[in-house]
């Protein structure tokens, strides 16, 4: 029986060009975590496997850093990074737990300020 729960950072926002940590935490279970996937709906970002270590998708290699812990750090954010991110915990003997984080990447306040006070 799956007794665990996934706690996530929920809905988060960050500025364009900045970075953000995606973090999930599995609690209320003694199950062993054997692999954690970080995914979007249509592609995998990274995998942390207990035996194989970290794998980062080539599409994200330049701006994704593993950690802290089982989390994932996204760098050099663009507005295209806005969307859903999933952490999938593969555990033994429980099975699979999934958490969801929604990230909104905002135009930086500097960019907004500059645009607002542009000289015609």
């Amino acid at each position: 029986m799956m007794t665990g729960t996934i706690e996530t950072t929920g809905n988060i926002s960050a500025e364009k060009g900045g970075s953000i940590i995606l973090q999930c935490h599995l609690s209320s279970t003694t199950a062993q975590v054997t692999q954690v996937n970080w995914e979007q709906q249509d592609q995998l970002l990274a995998i942390c496997n207990a035996d194989l270590g970290w794998h980062i998708s080539p599409s994200f290699k330049d701006r994704v850093a593993p950690g802290p812990g089982l989390g994932l750090t996204l760098q050099s954010l663009t507005v295209n990074d806005t969307g859903e991110y999933f952490c999938i915990y593969h555990t033994y003997p429980d099975g699979t737990y999934t958490g969801r984080i929604f990230l909104e990447v905002l135009e930086s306040s500097v960019a907004e300020h500059g645009a607002r006070f542009q000289i015609p």
């Epitope: 692999q35 709906q41 592609q43 995998l44 194989l52 859903e84 699979t96």
Partner: antibody, heavy 118, light 107 residues
Amino acid sequence: QVQLQESGPGLVKPSETLSLTCAVSGYSITSDYAWNWIRQPPGKGLEWIGYISYSGSTSYNPSLRSRVTISRDTSKNQFFLKLSSVTAADTAVYYCARRQVGLGFAYWGQGTLVTVSS
Amino acid sequence: DIQMTQSPSSLSASVGDRVTITCKASQDVSTAVAWYQQKPGKAPKLLIYSASYRYTGVPSRFSGSGSGTDFTFTISSLQPEDIATYYCQQHYSTPWTFGQGTKVEIK
């Protein structure tokens, strides 16, 4: 228990549009997951067509993108496939399936055979 | 697109035999590979996900292994009800792609 059921015409004429419906019971298509269409020509392998996610976003196979539209009716808990300008090569069993991130296609409909012929 | 190449395309084995099917991805997909069983006239069934994890209710005689580009699916002791076609599939990135299938028959 989640169930998916495909329906639609079994015969479509060349150059016309193939239209299929997937009726989902036991789970709301707006709650979670990606809701997919996959096809299998007779005696051949499986080809992913595309999906509509619970939030309404879509993703299509580039090989079919110019001809495919996947949409949904949330009030009826159904999603749809439209494939335009069909040819004999589109003759296949069409499946709808629910995909879970990290797992794959865990739930499938029973499939419906669509033949393209004049 | 990521190509998934399965071998053999068909095999014949006796009840109780160990059966092994391999799948090669055209690029590194880490452990993002699933395996399906399809019986004639039926929809595929998910057996293995993330290369080595058995899906709910799948008998322990079915197992998977591998990472990167090379993957293996094993039936430790073939049973009459295992007669089917088996497919690998990458769940690394869209478009999701399948191997061409391996038909398993009883000798």
